[in-house]
């Protein structure tokens, strides 16, 4: 009678995470009697996966009908595979012994590789906002994928970026891997509507890459430009002075009028208009009663934008007999109705 052989026909098996792995094993003889056991790994630290004789192995089912009296098929199925299940599995025949069964013969082993999809890339930008012309860093992270090979690309508004660094960890063998990439992006004034995209391609994704996005609106701060103008007289002895706050982002803005250095009024931007590029415009006006002044008046529009140091623009209002001749005649936008008489 030929000596029993344990045959594992598959050198390797590749399974997607969440699926079921089938590990094949047959014996060439019923004799000697004793259980088949499946192990992951070899040597003293090997992990018992299934014991034909006893034990409870909820994830494991046998392929063949074990009630067959001449069963020599000891193939198993392992359900709900995760990357942690990767490794080499050995089908081992034991010979009955007293008090314990004795290892008799092992199959050559089957390497189980698990294909696991990367997690959705998470893109994060800088903690603080930055202004145009500055370079900011964005990071992209994705985890839990296997095998290790992966491709990561960065885009800004569909244009591929080249200034980035990527690491895949760990460097050595692992059940699953993570990718971390940092890209540098130069901000422009037009970036309020811009997006930075991190794109991850992996064999498990079947040509349909995963994308993570960050809106530059969360990152950029566009400081306003100010223009103070004197409008035509509305009535005798009254001058309308406007402060046009243009091209700012985000909307958080506080404006203060100063008359000869003294605070006249403070207001918060409310009814703003949005430009095509996503920035905002706002206008505030001040009605000045010139008859109350004997000297020239210095009017200052002071703007604090998004918690930054205030910027200001001043306008000298000359007190003379013909105030309506002074200043520019820029038409006022009907975006504010903040009138104030100064007495």
């Amino acid at each position: 009678e030929e000596e029993l052989q344990v045959i594992q026909p598959d050198k390797s098996v590749l399974v997607a995470a969440g699926e079921t792995a089938t590990l094949r094993c047959t014996a060439t003889s019923l004799i000697p009697v004793g259980p088949i056991q499946w192990f992951r790994g070899a040597g003293p630290g090997r992990e018992l996966i299934y014991n034909q004789k006893e034990g409870h192995f909820p994830r494991v089912t046998t392929v063949s009908d074990l009630t067959k009296r001449n069963n020599m098929d000891f193939s198993i199925r392992i359900g709900n595979i995760t990357p942690a299940d990767a490794g080499t599995y050995y089908c081992v025949k034991f010979r009955k012994g007293s008090p314990d069964d004795v290892e008799f013969k092992s199959g050559a082993g089957t390497e189980l590789s698990v294909r696991a999809k990367p997690s959705a890339p998470v893109v994060s930008g800088p903690a603080a906002r930055a202004t145009p012309q500055h370079t900011v860093s964005f990071t992209c992270e994705s985890h839990g994928f296997s095998p290790r090979d992966i491709t990561l690309k960065w885009f800004k508004n569909g244009n591929e970026l080249s200034d980035f660094q990527t690491n895949v960890d760990p460097v050595g063998e692992s059940v699953s891997y993570s990718i971390h990439s940092t890209a540098k992006v130069v901000l422009t004034r037009e970036d309020v509507h811009s997006q930075v995209i991190c794109e991850v391609a992996h064999v498990t994704l079947q040509g349909d890459p995963l994308r993570g996005t960050a809106n530059l609106s969360e990152t950029i701060r566009v400081p306003p430009t100010l223009e103070v103008t004197q409008q035509p007289v509305r009535a005798e002895n009254q001058v309308n002075v406007t402060c046009q706050v243009r091209k700012f982002y985000p909307q958080r803005l506080q404006l203060t009028w100063l008359e000869n250095g003294n605070v006249s009024r403070t207001e918060t931007a409310s009814t703003v208009t949005e430009n095509k590029d996503g920035t905002y415009n706002w206008m505030s006006w001040l009605l000045v009663n010139v008859s109350a002044h004997r000297d020239d008046v210095k009017l200052t529009c002071q703007v604090e934008h998004d918690g930054q140091p205030a910027v200001s623009k001043s306008h000298d209002l000359k007190v003379s007999a013909h105030p309506k001749e002074q200043g520019s005649n820029t038409a006022a936008e009907n975006t504010g109705s903040n009138e104030r008489n100064i007495y």
């Epitope: 009908d65 074990l66 067959k68 009296r69 001449n70 009955k96």
Partner: antibody
Framework: EVQLLESGGGLVQPGGSLRLSCAAS????????MSWVRQAPGKGLEWVSA????????YYADSVKGRFTISRDNSKSTLYLQMNSLRAEDTAVYYC?????????????WGQGTLVTVSS | SYELTQPPSVSVSPGQTASITCSGD??????ACWYQQKPGQSPVLVIY???KRPSGIPERFSGSNSGNTATLTISGTQAMDEADYYC?????????FGGGTKLTVL
């Protein structure tokens, strides 16, 4: 409590046929292989036939191969033995026996037996 | 085909130890089972996988198996143990029984 109850035995002429039944209860019938074992008067036990839990695999002793057919109806928890071309040497008490499980099972439960007499 | 050989009869005095042997080629490489059958009754499993006792079987029943011989041992034999005993190789598609041994308690 596991119970196996054979029926269908009786007197039959040589060359005749008989169908034995074994009604099982007290266990999940489809999870176990089942066998027929016979014992001629004053003789020892002789295994006749076996069938796997699903019914997909059957086994026969050389002495009955081609004449006897084992089957099972798991929905009725019943085991059958169709015996054709009966001979005098088939005269015996026929026991239905349950396999003890999937790991080198013994016959852990037996029925009370049904007598088959083949005589002219 | 595989064959198992048992002595036709074994006698023992009450309280003594009875040993019933079962021989077969390399039987020690297989699992032996033992059945007890009293007159007019169905067989009852007393030992399986060489040494294991089903629940309800008294501790005086024990088994061993090595080389070419399996042995059923009944220590402190009682009158109620008088019966026919059959060995079986519990590992093949065809269940082979020994010829049986009649145990007589004198």
């Amino acid at each position: 409590e596991v119970q196996l109850l054979e029926s269908g035995g009786g007197l039959v002429q040589p060359g005749g046929s008989l169908r034995l039944s074994c009604a099982a209860s007290g266990f999940t019938f489809s999870s176990y292989a089942m066998s027929w074992v016979r014992q001629a008067p004053g003789k020892g036990l002789e295994w006749v036939s076996a069938i796997s839990g699903s019914g997909g695999d059957t086994y026969y002793a050389d002495s009955v191969k081609g004449r006897f057919t084992i089957s099972r109806d798991n929905s009725k928890s019943t085991l059958y033995l169709q015996m054709n071309s009966l001979r005098a040497e088939d005269t015996a008490v026929y026991y239905c026996a349950k396999d003890g499980g999937s790991y080198y099972p013994p016959f852990d439960y037996w029925g009370q037996g049904t007598l088959v007499t083949v005589s002219s | 085909s595989y064959e198992l050989t048992q002595p036709p009869s074994v006698s023992v005095s009450p309280g003594q130890t009875a040993s019933i042997t079962c021989s077969g080629d390399k039987l020690g490489d297989r699992y032996a089972c033992w059945y007890q059958q009293k007159p007019g009754q169905s067989p009852v499993l007393v030992i399986y996988q060489d040494t294991k006792r089903p629940s309800g079987i008294p501790e005086r029943f024990s088994g061993s198996n090595s080389g070419n011989t399996a042995t059923l041992t009944i220590s402190g034999t009682q009158a109620m143990d008088e019966a026919d005993y059959y060995c079986q190789a519990c590992d093949s598609s065809t269940a082979v029984f020994g010829g049986g041994t009649k145990l007589t308690v004198l």
